[in-house]
């Protein structure tokens, strides 16, 4: 004969555990039913009566099978720098994430507690490491042969245009100005980060001689909430 299925509440066999979606009630010393997501225990089980469940009230939730006497409170409404990516329902908490142009400076289990605007690199500095959902932009000085003339949280240092004849030499915050009618721009992949080699045909001049190596990490600006550092703006 097949073993008889036990209905909750029931006393578990010594050494065995309760089944899925059941819990062991220490007071009743019985295996009792859990409540489904969106519900909570209104009446705990006894030796002869199973758990009585009730729906979570407005603005409260339970995400898992449970036997809690009270549902959890949904988080407060999302702030103006946030977007609600998941609404508060009886089965899930509200999730707030940062809106575009912002990153999460203080995260919580799900979503973000505190958003901060992404750092903007000022002219002469470009984005070394782009911002993510949870990290700020890192700025770095533009290396010789590259420039950035914008205040931006996305723009990287771009190579100076290569002139046949240079009218105004480029610097970290300004592109070179050519006198010839057809300037050429180097598209070498490494050119964004490294100074441009001078073409034997060009009269391109470097503003100041600097080592032609990529900047060391000491150029990178600190991450996290801090006063605007050199190369970044607070707005």
């Amino acid at each position: 004969l097949p073993a008889q299925v036990a209905f909750t509440p029931y006393a578990p066999e010594p050494g065995s555990t309760c089944r899925l979606r059941e819990y062991y009630d220490q007071t009743a010393q019985m295996c009792c039913s859990k409540c489904s997501p969106g519900q909570h225990a209104k009446v705990f089980c006894t030796k002869t009566s199973d758990t009585v469940c009730d729906s979570c009230e407005d603005s409260t939730y339970t995400q898992l099978w449970n036997w809690v006497p009270e549902c959890l409170s949904c988080g407060s409404r999302c702030s103006s720098d946030q977007v609600e990516t998941q609404a508060c329902t009886r089965e899930q908490n509200r999730i707030c994430t940062c809106r575009p142009g912002w990153y999460c400076a203080l995260s919580k289990q799900e979503g973000c507690r505190l958003c901060a605007p992404l750092r903007k690199c000022r002219p002469g500095f470009g984005v070394a490491r782009p911002g993510t959902e949870t990290s700020d932009v890192v700025c770095k000085p533009c290396a010789p042969g590259t420039f950035s003339n914008t205040t931006s949280s996305t723009d990287i240092c771009r190579p100076h245009q290569i002139c046949n004849v240079v009218a105004i030499p480029g610097n970290a915050s300004m592109d070179a100005v050519c006198t010839s009618t057809s300037p050429t721009r180097s598209m070498a992949p490494g050119a964004v980060h490294l100074p441009q080699p001078v073409s034997t045909r060009s009269q391109h001049t470097q503003p100041t001689p600097e080592p032609s190596t990529a900047p060391s990490t000491s150029f990178l600006l600190p991450m996290g909430p801090s006063p605007p550092a050199e190369g970044s703006t607070g707005d």
């Epitope: 209104k42 009446v43 009566s49 009585v52």
Partner: antibody, heavy 119, light 106 residues
Framework: QVTLKESGPGILQPSQTLSLTCSFS??????????VGWIRQPSGKGLEWLAH???????FYNPSLKSQLTISKDTSRNQVFLKLTSVVTADTATYYC???????????WGQGTTLTVSS | DVQMTQSPSSLSASLGGKVTITCKAS??????IAWYQHKPGKGPRLLIH???TLQPGIPSKFSGSGSGRDYSFSISNLEPEDIATYYC????????FGGGTKLEIT
Amino acid sequence: QVTLKESGPGILQPSQTLSLTCSFSGFSLSTSGMGVGWIRQPSGKGLEWLAHIWWDDDKFYNPSLKSQLTISKDTSRNQVFLKLTSVVTADTATYYCARLTGTRYFDYWGQGTTLTVSS
Amino acid sequence: DVQMTQSPSSLSASLGGKVTITCKASQDINKFIAWYQHKPGKGPRLLIHYTSTLQPGIPSKFSGSGSGRDYSFSISNLEPEDIATYYCLQYGNLWTFGGGTKLEIT
């Protein structure tokens, strides 16, 4: 309005049996999740849970006094009874009855009845 | 059985001040703790259940917190009517009261 009131003999001699009654109003023991329990407080000491009974007649007793205690109810008369056999002087105390919620804490209490055990 | 160690057993505080009482359980009680105020000649009065939920009608000057085995209860802005003995009750595994804390106000 929930109210509970305890009544008892006041004075007993050692070895006698204590019989207490809790009469309540404002709720019914036929309602799912309702329970009534007994707690005592010896003079100058703390509170001690003794026993309680649920709407479905499930009963719980303090393990250290289980052999001496019996709890019962009369649902239609809104009463719960407690018997404690073979009393000793250490059972001198104020005895309280209290309502239990479905999630097992005591939310309403009576004012208590005093028992003195003396020869 | 679950034992509840309540401390201090007595304390004195000044009007308008704040006091904190702690209860330590001998095992995890899953936040199933209640706090009561008890005055002579009356039955205990429920203040807080499930660690931090205020009973309806109880002022927010009373608060509770904790998890696992360690729980605390605070009263702020002390008034003369707060003079009483306070008890914790664990109801996660049968029922056990703490030893009580007698509060005096100076």
